[in-house]
Amino acid sequence: WELTILHTNDVHSRLEQTSEDSSKCVNASRCMGGVARLFTKVQQIRRAEPNVLLLDAGDQYQGTIWFTVYKGAEVAHFMNALRYDAMALGNHEFDNGVEGLIEPLLKEAKFPILSANIKAKGPLASQISGLYLPYKVLPVGDEVVGIVGYTSKETPFLSNPGTNLVFEDEITALQPEVDKLKTLNVNKIIALGHSGFEMDKLIAQKVRGVDVVVGGHSNTFLYTGNPPSKEVPAGKYPFIVTSDDGRKVPVVQAYAFGKYLGYLKIEFDERGNVISSHGNPILLNSSIPEDPSIKADINKWRIKLDNYSTQELGKTIVYLDGSSQSCRFRECNMGNLICDAMINNNLRHTDEMFWNHVSMCILNGGGIRSPIDERNNGTITWENLAAVLPFGGTFDLVQLKGSTLKKAFEHSVHRYGQSTGEFLQVGGIHVVYDLSRKPGDRVVKLDVLCTKCRVPSYDPLKMDEVYKVILPNFLANGGDGFQMIKDELLRHDSGDQDINVVSTYISKMKVIYPAVEGRIKFSHHHHHH
C-alpha cells in the first residue's frame, strides 16, 4: 500500500508568491510559492495519485503583514481552501496568546490540529478541550493512518502560550499516544511536529511505532540529487534514521516560507511496516501556474493590507536617525529603538530568579535602511517601517558564548570608517572601542545587562558564559561577515517578523523618543567620522 505525503512547514504568512529569497515578489516571472501555486501542485498530485495526505508541521503564523492584519484568520481560510489534512502546532501559533490561537485558527480550521506534548491545565483545560488533539486517525482510501503531533518544548521562551499550557518532553509525551494508536489497530503512524531537525531525528530513533517523521522549526532543507535553487541540503531526502529497535525511519522537512512542497512516497506492507520511501521537495517556481480561483481570493483579501500599511501606528517626537552616516559609524537612535523593541518583544517571565530570560540585542547598522522624519506630525506607519526594514527578516533568539560575542564586536569595527554594514547597534550592552588599536583588538570594554537579577545592571562579559541574544536572522546566518556567530552559536530559534516587532512596540508605547545614550563609546579620543 502506497501513501503520498505532501508537507509544508514554517510557511510564516507567505500567502502570496515571493522572490527567490522569500521576500516580497518583485518580478512575477521569477517568483515562487504562495498558496495559489501550492494549490495547483497539490491538486495535480491528488488527481494523479490515490492516497495523498497534505500535512503542515507548524509555524503558519507570523512573518508578513498578512499575519499582522488578519491574525490567523487568513491561515484557517486558505488552509481550509487547500484542504490540508492535518497540522501540528508550532511555537509561533502562540504569538498572539492562546486566545489568538483558539478563535482564528482552532475554531475555524476544518482539519485536525495536533500536539501530544501540550497539556492544558486550570480554567483553560475545559475551554480548549477538543480544539486540538494529541493525535488523529485519518481515513486514507481503504486504510487508516495515525498522525501524532508535537511542538517545541521551548515554546514558553519563544512565544506567548501563557501559564495554563504545559509543554512536556516530546519523546515522553509521544510514546503513550503512539501506543494508544497501536491498540486501536492503527499500524501506519506519522509523527508530525515542530521541534527542529535534531528532535525529529531523536523521535525517529526513540519513539517505538513511529513510521515516518515530518518536521519543522529548523527550516531544514533536505534533497537527493542536484538542488533546484539556492538552498544547500543538510542531507538526503528523506533522511533515514535507524531506530533503537532496528527500523529504518524516514525523516523529512521542507525548508520554509512555502517555497517547496515536500513530496514523500512511502510503501507499507500489510502489517504497516515501511518497505521503501523516496521523494524530494518540489520547488514551487513560476513553471507551476497559480490557481486562478485561489489567486482571486488572495487579491480580495489583499485590499485590507494596503489600507493598513498607511494607518498611524504611533508617533515619534524626535528624529529617528536611521541614516547610514550615523548607524554605520556610531550609536544611532533608530538602532536603539529597534533593539529596545526586540527586547520588549521577548519579555517572558518564566523563572522567578530572572527578570527576563534575555537582555541583549545586537543589530547590524547596515540593516537599517532609512530614517523617519518627525516633522510629518510625528506619524509612523507600517509603510515607514518597511522602508527602515525592507528585507522581510526576523528577529531571532540565539545562545552564544561570551567569546563569540567578543569576536562579533571586534568584527563590528575591524575595518571601521568605510561605511560598511557590520557596525553593530546594541541593546543591553555597553561597548567601548579604541580605534587606535589594531583590528581584532579594538574592544576595550564590553559590559552586558544581567538577567539573573532583580535590579538589572551592567557586568563585564564573561568569555566562557553562555548568553542569550536577540539579533536579526541575517546575523544568525553569518551575514555581513559574522561567520563566527553562524559557526559558534549553540542554539538558534527563529523569531518574529522584524517590522512587526517594531510596529507592535510603537503601538504599545504610543509616543516614542529614543535617545543616543552612551551604549557605544570610543576611547583614546580617536578621531572618527
Epitope: 476544518k110 488523529k136 481515513p139
Partner: nanobody
C-alpha cells in the same frame, strides 16, 4: 468541549420507521463529519452511515442501503438518521460520533468524540 447526544430510539415493529437525532454542542457542526454506528449484543460495532462536513457526501453500510437516510441541519446543530423498513437485525444500540475532517468514513477509529447510545429494538 465537544459533546454529542443521540436520541429517538425505541421499540418498533418490523417494517416500521424511526428517526434518530444527534445533537452536538461545544463546536460548529459545519466543520465536522458525523457518523452513526451501532452495536448489537455480542457483535462488533458496525459503521452504519456518515455525512461529511459539507453535507455533500454520504455513505451507507450495504445492510442499510436504500432503507436509511442520513441528513444534517447545521442551523440546529443536529444530524438525523431516518430509518425505514426496519428489520429485527437492526436491533442495536445506536451511537453518533464526530470528527473534524472533510471526508466521510464508517471506520470507528477515525472518530474523536462519541455520544451516549440510544437503544433501537425491532420486534413484533
Amino acid at each position: 468541549d465537544v459533546q454529542l447526544q443521540a436520541s429517538g430510539g425505541g421499540l418498533v415493529q418490523p417494517g416500521g420507521s424511526l428517526r434518530l437525532s444527534c445533537v452536538v454542542s461545544g463546536f460548529t457542526l459545519d466543520y465536522y463529519t458525523i457518523g452513526w454506528f451501532r452495536q448489537a449484543p455480542g457483535k462488533e460495532r458496525e459503521g452504519v452511515s456518515c455525512i461529511n462536513s459539507s453535507g455533500g457526501v454520504t455513505n451507507y453500510a450495504d445492510s442499510v442501503k436504500g432503507r436509511f437516510t442520513i441528513s444534517r441541519d447545521n442551523a440546529k446543530n443536529t444530524v438525523y438518521l431516518q430509518m425505514n423498513s426496519l428489520k429485527s437485525e437492526d436491533t442495536a444500540v445506536y451511537y453518533c460520533a464526530a470528527q473534524k475532517y472533510y471526508y466521510c468514513s464508517r471506520k470507528g477509529e477515525v472518530y474523536d468524540s462519541w455520544g451516549q447510545g440510544t437503544q433501537v429494538t425491532v420486534s413484533s
